[in-house]
C-alpha cells in the first residue's frame, strides 16, 4: 500500500462563522519539515502554501480574504514532506454571516427558568428561509438545527444550570450562507428549590479548538514530530 | 400591580369576525409572552395560541389555526386575537393570559353568536 | 399533543379536611406544570407553576408534588374559599394544554 503522512489538522482561526466581506483565515497544522501545504475547497484545490524554512515551522495559514458565499463551504488541506503527501485532514466547513435579514429570539416560558422545566426557543426571520439555527456563545459547533418556513422551534430540556448562558439564532439559505446573528437571549436556569440559585453550572469554556497552535521548532519537536501528530489526532 | 383588561362581553352575528382586546399595564408589555385560552360554557380550557409582543413571534394551537389570528399593538401595550367566520361554536370566554408560564390572567370576554 | 388526565373531576369534601388531586402528563414535561383555580364568576388565578412553587400570596396550606408523570395539588386544611374549580395546565410543549378540571364541593 502506497505510503502517507498523517492527517494534518484544519482549524478556522478564531471562529468558523465569518461575517461577509470580512477575512477568514484557516490553519493547517501538518508536521516539521513539510515543503508545500495545500488547501482544498469543495474537493479542488483552492490555494497552496509554502512555510519558509519548512523545518522550522508546523503548519501555515491561508488567508481568505472579503468572504462571501461562493467561498463558504467545505474545506481541508494536506501537506507533502518530500515526495510523500499526508492523509487529507477531516473536512471544515466554513460559514458565511450577515446575509440578509436579522432574526429576531424568543424563549418560552421566559429567559429566568427553575431546574427541570422545559424550555422553547423561538427563532423567526421574514425572508425566505427554511432552515434556522441556534447556537450558544462559547460552545458554536454545537449546532441545533430547526425547520420552518419563518419560524422554527428549539425545544430543549428539562433543563439544568449547564443550559445557562447566552443564545443566538440565525436564519440559513443554504447550510454554508447565515443570516446576521439574533440579539442574544441570555437564559438564567436556577437550581432547584432545595439546591437554590446558587448551584454551580458547567463552565462554558470558549471555542478553544477554534485557535491556531502552530509552533516554531525547537531540537526535541523535531525528534517529536510524528508523535505530536498522533497527540493531536488521539486529543480531536 | 399586573392588570388585564378584557371588554366583558360581545355578541356577534354567524359568520361575522370579531376582534377581542388585552389592554396589559403594570409590567413591560413587550418582555412577556401573551396567551390567550378558550372557555365554552360548563367546559374546561383551550390554549388557543401566545405572541410575542418584541418579536412578533406566535405560535398556534392547530385547532385554531385559520379561525384565530393573534396580534399586537405596542404603542398601547394591546394584546388582539382576531376571531373569523364565526359559528355557535365559537361562543365563549375567551381569556388572555400573560407570561409563558400563565402568570396573570385577565377577566375574560364572553362571546355571544347569535342570529 | 400532551393529554393531561386530571382526577378526580369532582370532589365533595369537608372543611379543615386533606385533599389532593392529580394530573397524569402523557410524555414527559419535566417540571414545567401549573395549578390554576377559576372562581363560580371565570376568575382565573395561578396558585402554583413549576410543579411545585407557590405563587405570593397563596396559602401556604396549597403545595405541588410531582411522582413521575402524576402530578399532585395538594389543599392540607380546606377553607370555605377553596372549593371551587381547579386546573392543571403544562407549558412544556406547545400546544400546551389543560387538564379537565376538578370540581371541588363541600360536603
Known amino acids: 500500500p502506497k505510503q502517507t503522512l498523517p492527517k494534518p489538522i484544519i482549524r478556522a482561526e478564531s471562529t468558523y462563522m465569518v461575517p461577509k466581506e470580512k477575512q477568514a483565515t484557516l490553519c493547517c497544522q501538518g508536521s516539521y519539515g513539510a515543503v508545500e501545504y495545500q488547501l482544498h475547497f469543495e474537493g479542488s484545490l483552492f490555494a497552496v502554501e509554502r512555510p519558509k524554512p519548512p523545518e522550522r515551522i508546523n503548519g501555515v495559514k491561508f488567508h481568505i480574504p472579503d468572504m462571501n458565499s461562493r467561498k463558504a463551504g467545505r474545506y481541508s488541506c494536506i501537506y507533502r514532506v518530500g515526495e510523500l503527501w499526508s492523509e487529507r485532514s477531516d473536512l471544515l466547513d466554513l460559514v458565511v454571516t450577515e446575509m440578509y435579514d436579522t432574526p429576531t429570539l424568543s424563549v418560552h416560558p421566559g429567559p429566568e427558568v427553575t431546574s427541570g422545566e422545559k424550555v422553547t426557543f423561538y427563532c423567526r426571520l421574514d425572508t425566505a428561509t427554511s432552515m434556522f439555527l441556534l447556537l450558544k456563545e462559547g460552545r458554536s459547533r454545537d449546532v441545533q438545527r430547526s425547520y420552518g418556513k419563518v419560524q422554527a422551534e428549539f425545544p430543549m430540556g428539562p433543563v439544568t444550570t449547564a443550559h445557562r448562558g447566552s443564545y443566538r439564532c440565525f436564519g440559513s439559505y443554504n447550510n454554508y450562507a447565515w443570516s446576521f446573528p439574533s440579539e442574544p437571549v441570555k437564559l438564567l436556569v436556577t437550581g432547584d428549590i432545595e439546591n437554590t440559585s446558587l448551584a454551580p453550572t458547567d463552565p462554558t469554556f470558549p471555542d478553544s479548538w477554534d485557535t491556531c497552535l502552530l509552533t516554531r521548532e525547537t531540537g526535541l519537536q523535531k525528534d517529536l514530530a510524528l508523535w505530536d501528530h498522533t497527540a493531536q489526532n488521539l486529543l480531536r | 400591580q399586573v392588570q388585564l383588561q378584557q371588554p366583558g362581553s360581545v355578541l356577534v352575528r354567524p359568520g361575522a369576525s370579531v376582534k377581542l382586546s388585552c389592554k396589559a399595564s403594570?409590567?413591560?408589555?413587550?418582555?412577556?409572552?401573551m396567551h390567550w385560552a378558550k372557555q365554552r360554557p360548563g367546559q374546561g380550557l383551550e390554549w388557543i395560541g401566545h405572541i410575542h409582543p418584541n418579536s412578533g413571534i406566535s405560535n398556534y394551537n392547530e385547532k385554531f389555526k385559520g379561525k384565530a389570528t393573534l396580534t399586537v399593538d405596542t404603542s398601547s401595550s394591546t394584546a388582539y386575537v382576531d376571531l373569523s367566520s364565526l359559528t355557535s361554536e365559537d361562543s365563549a370566554v375567551y381569556y388572555c393570559?400573560?407570561?409563558?408560564?400563565?402568570?396573570?390572567w385577565g377577566a375574560g370576554t364572553t362571546v355571544t353568536v347569535s342570529s | 399533543d400532551i393529554q393531561m388526565t386530571q382526577s378526580p373531576s369532582s370532589l365533595s369534601a369537608s372543611l379543615g379536611e386533606r385533599v389532593s388531586l392529580t394530573c397524569r402528563a402523557s410524555q414527559d414535561i419535566g417540571s414545567s406544570l401549573n395549578w390554576l383555580q377559576q372562581e363560580p364568576d371565570g376568575t382565573i388565578k395561578r396558585l402554583i407553576y413549576a410543579t411545585s412553587r407557590l405563587d405570593s400570596g397563596v396559602p401556604k396550606r396549597f403545595s405541588g408534588s410531582r411522582s413521575g408523570s402524576d402530578y399532585s395539588l395538594t389543599i392540607s386544611s380546606l377553607e370555605s374559599e377553596d372549593f371551587v374549580d381547579y386546573y392543571c395546565?403544562?407549558?412544556?410543549?406547545?400546544?400546551?394544554?389543560f387538564g379537565g378540571g376538578t370540581k371541588l364541593e363541600i360536603k
Open positions: 393570559s400573560r407570561g409563558g408560564r400563565f402568570d396573570d
Open positions: 395546565l403544562q407549558y412544556a410543549s406547545s400546544p400546551w394544554t
Open positions: 403594570g409590567y413591560t408589555f413587550t418582555s412577556s409572552w
